[in-house]
Amino acid sequence: QQAPYWTHPQRMEKKLHAVPAGNTVKFRCPAAGNPTPTIRWLKDGQAFHGENRIGGIRLRHQHWSLVMESVVPSDRGTYTCLVENAVGSIRYNYLLDVLERSPHRPILQAGLPANTTAVVGSDVELLCKVYSDAQPHIQWLKHIVINGSSFGADGFPYVQVLKTADINSSEVEVLYLRNVSAEDAGEYTCLAGNSIGLSYQSAWLTVLPEEDPTWTAAAPEARYTD
């Protein structure tokens, strides 16, 4: 027999969850023990079943999770998972703060991505930092030329999607370009979107031919310019 213990404590490190109103919140307390423990949830010290909550809650015992959709300010509080079996019990507190700011289009940090100059064969990183109340998704685009033109008949640029990702708010998103060639030169755009809209910022990558070995030693591998 064994008292309950956390199986993935690293997934429980984020104690404070500050989320915009309208978002979905998920708390998890994955545990094990012998006999298999049960889990119940408290809100501010009281048994919590979500009866008084618009939209209710989802309890997924096999995932040791509590899910609340479309959180509102009245959902703020301390949420405790209480895991117990015949041998013992453990508990963990999560703090939920619901932010009421007006959700806005993603804001991209000025100057990112930055114009960059690199040498053929080198590696390049383009950075994009996104601030967004609603969870943002991101795309990296490369502007391309088709039949000698950068723009279609409708006046919009031709682009190729290089990468698509969902990210957490305020994360830095990186586009890695390995072993660049002359064909990699051009305009790159970081596009961030959320439920309100899209925001774009672009940068140019200049790729120089391999440098003459007689002066390579004095030159940096990649130069970054604004």
Partner: antibody, heavy 124, light 112 residues
Framework: EVQLLESGGGVVQPGRSLRLSCAAS????????MHWVRQAPGKGLEWVAV????????YYADSVKGRFTISRDNSKNTLSLQMNSLRVEDTAIYYC?????????????????WGQGTMVTVSS | DIVMTQSPLSLPVTPGEPASISCTSS???????????VYWYLQKPGQSPQVLIY???NRFSGVPDRFSGSGSGTDFTLKISRVEAEDVGVYYC?????????FGGGTKVEIK
Amino acid sequence: EVQLLESGGGVVQPGRSLRLSCAASGFTFSSYAMHWVRQAPGKGLEWVAVISYDGSNKYYADSVKGRFTISRDNSKNTLSLQMNSLRVEDTAIYYCVRGAGRGYTYGPDGFDIWGQGTMVTVSS
Amino acid sequence: DIVMTQSPLSLPVTPGEPASISCTSSRSLLHSDGKTYVYWYLQKPGQSPQVLIYELSNRFSGVPDRFSGSGSGTDFTLKISRVEAEDVGVYYCMQYIEAPLTFGGGTKVEIK
């Protein structure tokens, strides 16, 4: 052809509930945020709610918060608005509007496609 | 919330003559990406609103070039270079930078 078709409007008494639906066709519904906008008779336009492409984010106008719930079923290309505790001032034509896409867009990033609207009348 | 104020309320026009509608926002609609997120719509009698202009000055596909949008971060103008009979209806400006999305009160354009 890109199209949004609302349904579910009607006459209802104050305090009662109504559920509006919007059927989308001609585009990848699951890649777009969706909005509801309403227009009271003879009045201007008022934004009501938005839901993200995957349903994880929802935002509401203060005038409907706590009473209305926006939802979507991407498998059926359907947007819904559950309206509870209806008030006389909720009387309006309700429009379903396509929002921002999940990626690069040629032209405006949303609010370009509107349905024809469905009329909701709250009256005793 | 961002307040959008439109003027005039009503605009009687003569076909072939120019017309101009103003819209002011209570906060700048110039975003960090350099775009200004104001839209203009026309709602013809008995119809849904239709986009004319997006992102301050871009004409929506199929919109005649007699329509143009201009302005700064808080002051916007929709111009019709030569009004036609089919242009009658109510014109709305809208901010699309943050929720709640807000509309101007509308300008009713009618033929004199």
